[in-house]
Interface confidence: low
């Protein structure tokens, strides 16, 4: 049940987002979320997760990359990238001369 809060051991994570109350937080796991909204540069948020574990299994897209880990400050130095979008001229196996 993904909407139940985790009751497992807590881990300390780096917290860098508008919702942070301090430099670290405690949760069931650590998160790094890279989001690109329409017409804006991608923004990376670091924090703690307690709900919706299923998000951790999502594959990166051109709009979001959701990373999870479960050890002390494991999200501190993680850098994410978004799935690159290919224009027809950039597709594999094509020559653009």
């Amino acid at each position: 049940d993904p909407v139940k809060p985790s009751r497992g051991p807590l881990v300390t994570c780096t917290c860098e987002s508008p919702h942070c109350r301090g430099p670290t937080c405690q949760g069931a796991w650590c998160t790094v979320v890279l989001v690109r909204e329409e017409g804006r540069h991608p923004q990376e948020h670091r924090g703690c997760g307690n709900l919706h574990r299923e998000l951790c299994r999502g594959r990166p897209t051109e709009f979001v990359n959701h990373y999870c880990c479960d050890s002390h400050l494991c999200n501190r130095n993680v850098s994410l990238v978004l799935e690159a979008t290919q224009t027809p001229s950039e597709q594999p196996g094509t020559d653009s001369q």
Partner: antibody, heavy 122, light 108 residues
Framework: QVQLQQWGAGLLKPSETLSLTCAVY????????WNWIRQPPGKGLEWIGE???????NYNPSLKSRVTISLDTSKNQFSLKLSSVTAADTAVYYC????????????????WGQGTLVTVSS | SYVLTQPPSVSVAPGQTARITCGGN??????VHWYQQKPGQAPVLVVY???DRPSGIPERFSGSNSGNTATLTISRVEAGDEADYYC???????????FGGGTKLTVL
């Protein structure tokens, strides 16, 4: 390469307390969770519980009232105590590591101890 | 609590493909891990996170997970693959580990 080496008493009487210890070689305590799993003779695997680097624990509800898992970071060891044992607790007991990193959320056991057969008999 | 169901036994001839199933209610979104256990030995992780292999595990071992069934596939089965196989998940509703009952793979 992580190695787990475990030891403890192999023969107990009913109502006694099972006590096992697992030493960790070549691995960092802080990046993993440390687990105990048991296997009764001829049967399947049963997870007992886990402890993390800070000493926080998480136990199988069916055993929770009798189980204590603790760790000694100075010795890179963690221990299992199971109180009030009965014949139903006769099993091979394994210690195991759960790395909890990357995209794996929750436990997966990548390194195991050699196993200790614990027999409970009067 | 969450339950994983495995067939007690699977038999296959050498060189053929063995498929061992692990059933669970809506198991698809969960990460499924598989272990091989030979008599008198500790289990060995052979597939994790549905389909990834730890280093040292042959490519003959693969996994898939969808709907209500996860499957461990062993291609070109060898006599040395004869063992018990267990599936395992993390039950995120209560943060506990769940194992399947195990499947004995017999190589004919």
């Amino acid at each position: 390469q992580v190695q787990l080496q475990q030891w403890g008493a192999g023969l107990l009487k009913p109502s006694e307390t099972l006590s096992l210890t697992c030493a960790v070689y070549g691995g960092s305590f802080s990046s993993s969770y440390w687990n105990w799993i048991r296997q009764p003779p001829g049967k399947g695997l049963e997870w007992i519980g886990e402890v993390n680097h800070s000493g926080s624990t998480n136990y199988n509800p069916s055993l929770k009232s009798r189980v204590t898992i603790s760790l000694d970071t100075s010795k890179n060891q963690f221990s299992l105590k199971l109180s009030s044992v009965t014949a139903a607790d006769t099993a091979v007991y394994y210690c195991a590591r759960s790395p909890r990193s990357g995209r794996i959320v929750g436990a997966v056991f990548d390194y195991w101890g050699q196993g200790t057969l614990v027999t409970v008999s009067s | 609590s969450y339950v994983l169901t495995q067939p007690p036994s699977v038999s296959v001839a050498p060189g053929q493909t063995a498929r061992i199933t692990c059933g669970g209610n809506n198991i698809g979104p969960k990460s499924v891990h598989w272990y091989q256990q030979k008599p008198g030995q500790a289990p060995v992780l052979v597939v994790y996170d549905d389909s990834d292999r730890p280093s040292g595990i042959p490519e003959r071992f693969s996994g898939s997970n969808s709907g209500n069934t996860a499957t461990l596939t062993i291609s070109r089965v060898e006599a040395g693959d004869e063992a018990d196989y267990y599936c395992q998940v993390w039950d995120s509703s209560n943060d506990h580990v769940v194992f399947g009952g195990g499947t004995k793979l017999t190589v004919l």
